[in-house]
């Protein structure tokens, strides 16, 4: 009776479990009845980090230098190259696949502190009452137009990233 | 392809003035905060001063605040720097940018050196 399931670490291919290849390593073929399967090392520049049947190795990541980038730790045949940012930058993600001074904040939240040579810009949430519509790396959160002050009442409230709109009063006749 | 190309930079005396220039091309310049940074010799990169895209709001670094005013003409696609009372440790390449700050958006700077 041919498996329809196979252990971990291996595959199924024609009725038979085949054994994956190694982390650092491709599939050149695949086991047969008689021979076991076969697997070859990756490449300079290349690796797979995991028990699998692929064919091809995946290439390390490029550090850019053009876009500011350098390696923080050099890839082997079982990991990927990481990146980071030159001294004084930030990685834009976590992949880090490409560097700002510094980050901005994004609508509905606000600069509570500008960035410096030592550190990144730090955000916070506007709450109730305040607002931004734009990304900003040094506007903090505004405060809501008074309506009231205007003799004006709302006639849409705001929200984190939107500002009251005000209009007429409606006159008694 | 976004360009910044600075100019306006260049030897001074103490208590002097100067006044940066940035052309911007590549993207459009209305709809981007835009900053001056600079960096002295030996240093890291100090941000100097911001302004909205509009130009309606603006920030200055404290050592720079009361001597320095930065400015926008949108129908030019160019920022300002006015720079007025410098002093030796203004000293520095000055760069614009925009936000959100990509490396490889950057312009190559003028260069100002206060001297006597």
């Known amino acids: 009776e041919p498996p329809t399931a196979c252990r971990e670490k291996q595959y199924l291919i024609n009725s038979q479990c085949c054994s994956l290849c190694q982390p650092g390593q491709k599939l050149v073929s695949d086991c047969t009845e008689f021979t076991e399967t076969e697997c070859l090392p990756c490449g300079e520049s290349e690796f797979l980090d995991t028990w699998n049947r692929e064919t091809h190795c995946h290439q390390h990541k490029y550090c850019d230098p053009n876009l500011g980038l350098r390696v923080q730790q050099k890839g082997t045949s079982e990991t990927d190259t990481i990146c980071t940012c030159e001294e004084g930058w930030h990685c834009t993600s976590e992949a880090c696949e490409s560097c700002v001074l510094h980050r901005s904040c994004s609508p509905g939240f606000g600069v509570k502190q500008i960035a410096t040579g030592v550190s990144d810009t730090i955000c916070e949430p506007c709450p109730v009452g305040f607002f931004s519509n734009v990304s900003s790396a040094f506007e903090k959160c505004h405060p809501w137009t008074s309506c009231e002050t205007k003799d004006l009442v709302v006639q849409q409230a705001g929200t984190n990233k939107t500002d009251v709109v005000c209009g007429p009063q409606d006159r008694l006749r | 392809e976004v360009q910044l190309l600075e100019s306006g930079g260049g030897l001074v005396q103490p208590g002097g003035s100067l006044r940066l220039s940035c052309a911007a091309s590549?993207?459009?310049?209305?709809?981007?905060e835009m900053w001056w940074v600079r960096q002295a010799p030996g240093k890291g990169l100090e941000r100097v001063s911001a302004i909205n895209p509009q130009g309606t709001r603006t920030y200055y670094a404290d050592s720079v605040k009361g001597r320095f005013t930065i400015s926008r003409d949108n129908s030019k696609n160019t920022l300002y720097l006015q720079m007025n009372s410098l002093r030796a440790e203004d000293t520095a390449v000055y760069y614009c940018a925009k936000l959100p700050f990509y490396f490889q958006e950057w312009g190559q700077g003028t260069l100002v050196t206060v001297s006597s």
């Open positions: 590549g993207f459009t310049f209305r709809d981007y």
